[in-house]
């Protein structure tokens, strides 16, 4: 039986501009983590192979950093962030599991109060 | 226009050697996994092997490894197949394919017309 | 490896009626599994990635569903045209990775 869960940081927000770390964690299986698929949407972010490493997709290369452990940093961050993120396990002997992760990137305070009175 | 053309089938003798090409144009062929897959007479669509785009190992099928090797020349575009030692149950239409997504999406969009290699005595 | 079973193995469908295909994979696939249509002379077609989302340039009258292990291909009104065979087809991450086909089902008109 497959009884394998990941555990997610969840529905999460960010500043424009800082930084988020997106963190999965695969528990209650014995099964071997043969490597870890980073995406947003279809698109590969980044990959971390047990025997061959990270691999950071080239077009996140400059905004994206591998770790803590797993989990994947993302920097300079944009509006254009927000959206879902997953995190796929490739496991020996289970297969896959997938974790979900919706990142909201806001607006800072300051930003979002000018905003909001500015005078047209 | 993004394709895919194979060449190199033809007829070979049990035992014998053959080396397909597969030449890739429209897009940045050292991004993209580009494995090859065969269709043996009245069988099923059969995956043969590959190179990984982002780490660089080989894979290949249990039925071919250590008697097909594949290579990849960038500059021209180019995924080579060779084989050797064939057996009369290599006797295949070759596709080369394309993995849509950096080679990480694991389904296959654009697929050359295929090459025929027939294995008898 | 991955070992994917297709049932049924064929199909025959009335034009305009619908049609079912089921794939249930060895171990846990989600969400990496494709559909692709084989038609006699032609290369395989992509119908379905990521196990429900339609290729370019597919009718939407073909739909994919499923997750974990068991996946379903469903053609809401079949027509002539999409007579052949339907492969399902995974992939497999571990010491010696790689793509696994199911054995296809062959779809027939009435």
């Known amino acids: 039986m497959m009884t394998g869960t990941i555990e997610t940081t969840g529905n999460i927000s960010a500043e424009k501009g800082g930084s988020i770390i997106l963190q999965c964690h695969l528990s209650s299986t014995t099964a071997q983590v043969t490597q870890v698929n980073w995406e947003q949407q279809d698109q590969l972010l980044a990959i971390c192979n047990a025997d061959l490493g990270w691999h950071i997709s080239p077009s996140f290369k400059d905004r994206v950093a591998p770790g803590p452990g797993l989990g994947l940093t993302l920097q300079s961050l944009t509006v254009n962030d927000t959206g879902e993120y997953f995190c796929i396990y490739h496991t020996y002997p289970d297969g896959t599991y997938t974790g979900r992760i919706f990142l909201e990137v806001l607006e800072s305070s300051v930003a979002e109060h000018g905003a909001r009175f500015q005078i047209p | 226009e993004v394709q895919l053309v194979e060449s190199g089938g033809g007829l070979v003798q049990p035992g014998g050697s053959l080396r397909l090409s597969c030449a890739a144009s429209?897009?940045?062929?050292?991004?993209?996994?580009v494995p090859w897959v065969r269709k043996a007479p009245g069988k099923g669509l059969e995956w043969v092997g590959y190179i990984d785009p982002i780490f660089g190992p080989t894979y290949y099928a249990d039925e071919v490894k250590g008697r097909f090797t594949i290579s990849a020349d960038d500059s021209k575009n180019s995924l080579y197949l060779q084989m050797n030692s064939l057996k009369t149950e290599d006797t295949a239409v070759y596709y080369c394919?394309?993995?849509?997504?950096?080679?990480?999406?694991?389904?296959?969009?654009?697929w050359g017309q295929g090459t025929l290699v027939t294995v008898s005595s | 490896r991955i070992v994917m079973t297709q049932t049924p193995l064929s199909l025959s469908v009335t034009p305009g009626q619908p049609a079912s295909i089921s794939c249930q994979a060895s171990q846990r696939i989600s969400p990496y599994l494709a559909w692709y249509l084989d038609k006699p002379g032609q290369p395989p077609q992509l119908l379905i990635s990521r196990a429900s989302k339609l290729a370019s340039g597919v009718p939407d009258r073909f739909s994919g569903s499923g997750s974990g292990t068991d996946f379903t291909l469903k053609i809401s009104r079949v027509e002539a045209e999409d007579v052949g065979v339907y492969y399902c087809?995974?992939?497999?991450?571990?010491?010696?990775?790689?793509?696994?086909f199911g054995g296809g089902t062959k779809v027939e008109i009435k």
């Open positions: 087809q995974s992939y497999y991450v571990h010491t010696s990775s790689g793509y696994a």
């Open positions: 394919a394309r993995d849509y997504s950096y080679g990480y999406a694991y389904a296959l969009d654009i």
């Open positions: 429209g897009f940045d062929f050292s991004s993209y996994g």
